[in-house]
Amino acid sequence: GIDCQGGSRMCCRQEFFVDFREIGWHDWIIQPEGYAMNFCIGQCPLHIAGMPGIAASFHTAVLNLLKANTAAGTTGGGSCCVPTARRPLSLLYYDRDSNIVKTDIPDMVVEACGCS
Amino acid sequence: GLECDGKVNICCKKQFFVSFKDIGWNDWIIAPSGYHANYCEGECPSHIAGTSGSSLSFHSTVINHYRMRGHSPFANLKSCCVPTKLRPMSMLYYDDGQNIIKKDIQNMIVEECGCS
């Protein structure tokens, strides 16, 4: 996965900090106040979508080969820049009974991006 | 994740068989001759992109929160119908020494789809 730099237009990971207060979740999430969630942005033209390291999975490589070798549109729409690696984050929050609970929420932080 | 049934155009899993001959991989993949790779197809309108079940993760829900409020840089970020669950498949192939080896290849088969 590639990190976005300057005028990069190809699929890359953009660093982004989300503030829970900003999205109105501070009333139930106690800690942390926010986190570097990051997101994926950029183009996935066919010639790069199947490249190792850029393809989201083996499955993606297979589909992109088919797209290149067959009439367009036989295997779904365009390729999309999406998370390929994520990691969890621990949250301290109020449950329905107003107890404070700590839980590891999966897939919170985007670590890498690729073409679907 | 939804199965595509021809009636809905919302993000769903479409059954699809890939023949390794069709993509020119029959020279190194010995078995099987192909497999049900499947793929994701359909729309991810903003009102469903963040709903759990159709959503990729907590992360998608956060992004959608920003997107629906028109926050830059998320306003132009389109939600994509992508695999949310993939599973491996065993393959027999020739290694560099022309030996036949069996391996579980990760992320070969799309099991479920969701909106990124």
């Epitope: - | 020739y94 036949i100 069996k102």
Partner: antibody, heavy 117, light 107 residues
């Protein structure tokens, strides 16, 4: 349903040749690998050869390499095992079996090859 | 070539017994091991693949376990039709090799 039927076995003298056939039904041989596995009287199973789905890739056990040739006729949905320079130790019941990624998920009933002078 | 060694070579048991057969590979084969059942005068029957996945049509009293080099086939409660010879086989690399077999007899 999937069915494999072997034929062509018999009694043959050492050094002579024999061609075994395996007729498949319920599936197409061009989509699967087909193996030959043999079993000497009162002994265990021994893998002999395979022709993979694309028809170009073939593999043999060291014990038969250079003497046995595996081939396929897609129009007849049949796989063949051409056995030359037969030896007493080739005496066995020969099974053809359908490949499931290196496993054998369907077997024929076998054809007996006896090499004897 | 990968050598497969089964133990015991033969085994006597009664209907209702729980029986375990072991198979050892001469090198790591991950979980790429299968089990077959063969009755006299019949072709082998595919029972278990990938060490623990049961082939459709095989009775649920058969189960497999193990990975790497050591594997087991377990029959939870022997039925009269289970008396046969059992073979393990590795599908990790060519040549595909079988164990020498375990003959399961009535006590």
């Amino acid at each position: 349903q999937v069915q494999l039927v072997e034929s062509g076995g018999g009694v043959v003298q050492p050094g002579r040749s024999l061609r075994l056939s395996c007729v498949a039904s319920g599936f197409t041989v061009s989509s699967y690998g087909i193996h030959w596995v043999r079993q000497a009287p009162g002994k265990g199973l021994e893998w002999v050869s395979v022709i993979w789905y694309d028809g170009r890739n073939k593999d043999y056990a060291d014990s038969v390499k250079g003497r046995f040739t595996i081939s396929r006729d897609n129009s007849k949905n049949t796989v063949y095992l051409e056995m030359k320079g037969l030896r007493a130790e080739d005496t066995a019941l020969y099974y053809c079996a359908r490949d499931k990624t290196g496993d054998f998920d369907s077997w024929g009933q076998g054809t007996l090859v006896t090499v004897s002078s | 070539d990968i050598q497969m060694t089964q133990s015991p070579s033969s085994l006597s048991a009664s209907v209702g017994d729980r029986v375990t057969i072991t198979c050892r590979a001469s090198q790591n084969i991950n979980s790429f091991l299968s089990w077959y059942q063969q009755k006299p005068g019949k072709a082998p029957k595919f029972l278990i693949y990938d060490a623990s996945s049961i082939q459709s049509g095989a009775p649920s009293r058969f189960s497999g376990s193990g990975s790497g080099t050591d594997f087991t086939l377990t029959i939870s409660s022997l039925q009269p039709e289970d008396f046969a010879t059992y073979y393990c086989q590795q599908s990790y690399s060519s040549p595909f090799t079988f164990g020498q077999g375990t003959k399961l007899e009535i006590k």
